[in-house]
């Protein structure tokens, strides 16, 4: 058993049929010595008396809010949560496996630039009685500070018969130099509590590996005289690291109709303009990627050909 | 310890081409190592990230763009002295700071070159003959060093009398290639910045 936060404790259980469970001793936080009784949750049934209560925790029915009282007055609470371990593996029931970029990916993180600011998100099908707490650091043995905000519900989607909820959190490394060469990864730890179930999820990454620029901005078209070609130009996104001559981007320019199966014109360039062939009912799209370290491409920025 | 903006005309910067070739060569070599050594811990997640130039050079700080010198997190630089007679810029206006930056890059390359050559000598003794260093990568390191054209004492190639541990050597190769790729990215950014200034 260990303390998650004040008056909240996590009991780690090997989860298999007829498992013996864990013996837990609760102590009432009071100077009083006599006349103390214990109850669980909303029940008025007295579980025991005395300053300490010893319980055998085997299943979720044994978890919950234990309260010690004296003469009708509440003295203190202890909330017990369960963390299940099945076949040596901690349970991952609360969050959905996003399977990208690989299996068992529960947390996904992205950064728009090298400033040390990043966003992580996760998915769940659970809608109520759900809380998250996020901590982060650079390195684990001698951790350097990363400050994370509160996790918030950022999107709701319908997937078949199920509703899916996306939560996200923003974090900022306390003293980040955009030009630095990372040797210690960022560690992100998410504590998830659903009713009386506790789970924790972690992700470890270098900012350079989670870079995904915003799409290029200000796409403009200029038809070329006596030609089917148009010159398309754009600018670096405002959120990208500066100076741009140091943090350079490369671009992919594509002309395509509505269907992915349609024919297309595609060209890659390090410049902020390109010449392509425009077709009726097609659109020109441009996306960006770090020129020197190939992490993710940005989403497309698009304009119609006409 | 930063780069001033008064740098040479675009076109006057032969190092940019060499640094692009360097990044390409080390990226290809790293990809080859990851494929060939698929049963070794050779991915970014599996290896320890070591920097053989740590406390010996300070390329990131010495080559910091002017715009980032306002960022205090970028300025915890280690003082290191460098040789200052680089010719990469082909310009009389080469500033002291820029020479410091370029000589730091040169020292990085020299240290990696020695490490890679020592390692290759060991890998050539491996009866499995599983992986060797790409001669193109070694040649590209040499070309960029020549373009930087700094005079410095030659570092003797380390020779080891004991029987090499090929497993350890291959893991060390992965560590070295990952670190060198990150440094090659920095070098490319620096050259691009200097070329544009």
């Amino acid at each position: 058993i260990w303390e998650l936060k004040k008056d909240v404790y996590v009991v780690e259980l090997d989860w298999y049929p007829d498992a013996p469970g864990e013996m837990v001793v609760l102590t009432c936080d009071t100077p009083e010595e006599d006349g103390i009784t214990w109850t669980l949750d909303q029940s008025s049934e007295v579980l025991g008396s005395g300053k300490t209560l010893t319980i055998q925790v085997k299943e979720f029915g044994d978890a919950g809010q234990y309260t010690c009282h004296k003469g009708g007055e509440v003295l203190s609470h202890s909330l017990l949560l369960l963390h299940k371990k099945e076949d040596g593996i901690w349970s991952t029931d609360i969050l959905k496996d996003q399977k990208e970029p690989k299996n068992k990916t529960f947390l996904r993180c992205e950064a728009k630039n090298y400033s040390g600011r990043f966003t992580c998100w996760w998915l769940t099908t659970i809608s109520t009685d759900l809380t998250f707490s996020v901590k982060s650091s650079r390195g684990s043995s001698d951790p350097q500070g990363v400050t994370c905000g509160a996790a918030t519900l950022s999107a709701e989607r319908v997937r078949g018969d199920n509703k899916e909820y996306e939560y996200s959190v923003e974090c900022q490394e306390d003293s980040a130099c955009p030009a630095a060469e990372e040797s210690l990864p960022i560690e992100v730890m998410v504590d998830a509590v659903h009713k009386l179930k506790y789970e924790n999820y972690t992700s470890s990454f270098f900012i350079r590996d989670i870079i995904k620029p915003d799409p290029p901005k200000n796409l403009q078209l200029k038809p070329l005289k006596n030609s089917r070609q148009v010159e398309v130009s754009w600018e670096y996104p405002d959120t990208w690291s500066t100076p741009h001559s140091y943090f350079s981007l490369t671009f992919c320019v594509q002309v395509q109709g509505k269907s992915k199966r349609e024919k297309k014109d595609r060209v890659f360039t390090d410049k902020t303009s390109a010449t392509v062939i425009c077709r009726k009912n097609a659109s020109i799209s441009v996306r960006a990627q770090d020129r020197y370290y190939s992490s993710s491409w940005s989403e497309w920025a698009s304009v119609p050909c006409s | 310890r930063n780069l001033p903006v008064a740098t040479p005309d675009p076109g006057m910067f032969p190092c940019l081409h060499h640094s692009q070739n360097l990044l390409r060569a080390v990226s290809n070599m790293l990809q080859k190592a990851r494929q060939t050594l698929e049963f070794y811990p050779c991915t970014s997640e599996e290896i320890d990230h070591e920097d053989i130039t740590k406390d010996k050079t300070s390329t990131v700080e010495a080559c910091l763009p002017l715009e980032l010198t306002k960022n205090e997190s970028c300025l915890n630089s280690r003082e290191t002295s460098f040789i200052t007679n680089g010719s990469c810029l082909a310009s009389r206006k080469t500033s002291f700071m820029m020479a410091l930056c370029l000589s730091s890059i040169y020292e990085d390359l020299k240290m990696y070159q020695v490490e890679f050559k020592t390692m290759n000598a060991k890998l050539l003794m491996d009866p499995k003959r599983q992986i060797f260093l790409d001669q193109n990568m070694l040649a590209v390191i040499d070309e960029l060093m020549q373009a930087l054209n700094f005079n410095s004492e030659t570092v003797p190639q380390k020779s080891s009398l004991e029987e090499p541990d090929f497993y350890k050597t291959k893991i060390k190769l992965c560590i070295l290639l990952h670190a060198f790729r990150i440094r090659a990215v920095t070098i490319d950014r620096v050259m691009s910045y200097l070329n544009a200034s």
């Epitope: 089917r228 024919k263 297309k264 014109d265 360039t269 | -």
Partner: antibody, heavy 118, light 107 residues
């Protein structure tokens, strides 16, 4: 399976024209750009131009502008390349090639030898 | 027009050995470069698109690298069926242009 089958070899007199055909099978004809590339004996490849069979849009290499015409007949899934004012240096194997991507070629025809000789 | 220069023009190789062909562009073309194989009397065949993207059905011994002005096609271990002429082609701008070709022959 996608195939491009070209018409047979031709012998032409200088100053005349030649029209080479390229019939496509497999896949929808108008879903691909169609290009013409030539190869003179012992020489490399030389791009001549492309057509979008869907709308008849064409683009030609400046070297051939005014002398080459590329057309397409959707009903027969056939593209044509006509080269006029032939000279001896136009002796070459003419190949059609296609792709959904405009700027490179994933399927090629077998080639048609055009000999220009007096 | 962008001029593409291949080297060497002829490359004698022992079967089973690796082979590398270089292609240089007269100006920067990013990764807009493609490689083809041509055998006498046969259709040309696309091997690599956009400098390094492998093509379905092409053996994994063919790989491409490069960007900007310098590109390489590598055949890791030459098989008897690989003896042919190889061309690079730029797609950065029209007119599309090819290298002169490299003939890989049996040593």
């Amino acid at each position: 399976q996608v195939q491009l089958v070209q018409s047979g070899a031709e012998v032409k007199k200088p100053g005349s024209s030649v029209k080479v055909s390229c019939k496509a099978s497999g896949g929808t004809f108008s879903d691909y750009y169609l290009h013409w590339v030539r190869q003179a004996p012992g020489q490399g490849l030389e791009w001549m131009g492309w057509i979008d069979p869907e709308n008849g849009d064409t683009e030609y290499a400046p070297k051939f502008q005014g002398r080459v015409t590329i057309t397409a007949d959707e009903s027969t899934s056939t593209a044509y390349m006509e080269l006029s004012s032939l000279r001896s240096e136009d002796t070459a194997v003419y190949m059609c090639a296609r792709n959904k991507e405009l700027r490179y070629f994933d399927v090629w025809g077998q080639g048609t030898l055009v000999t220009v000789s007096s | 027009d962008i001029v593409m220069t291949q080297s060497p023009l002829s490359l004698p190789v022992t079967p089973g050995e690796p082979a590398s062909i270089s292609c240089r562009a007269s100006q920067s073309i990013s990764i807009n470069l493609h490689w083809y194989q041509q055998k006498p009397g046969q259709q040309a065949r696309l091997l690599i698109a956009f400098a390094s993207q492998s093509i379905s059905g092409v053996p994994s011994r063919f790989s491409g690298s490069g960007s900007g002005t310098d590109f390489t096609l590598t055949i890791s271990s030459l098989q008897p069926e690989d003896f042919a002429t190889y061309y690079c082609q730029q797609s950065n701008s029209f007119p599309l242009t090819f290298g002169q070709g490299t003939k890989v022959e049996i040593k």
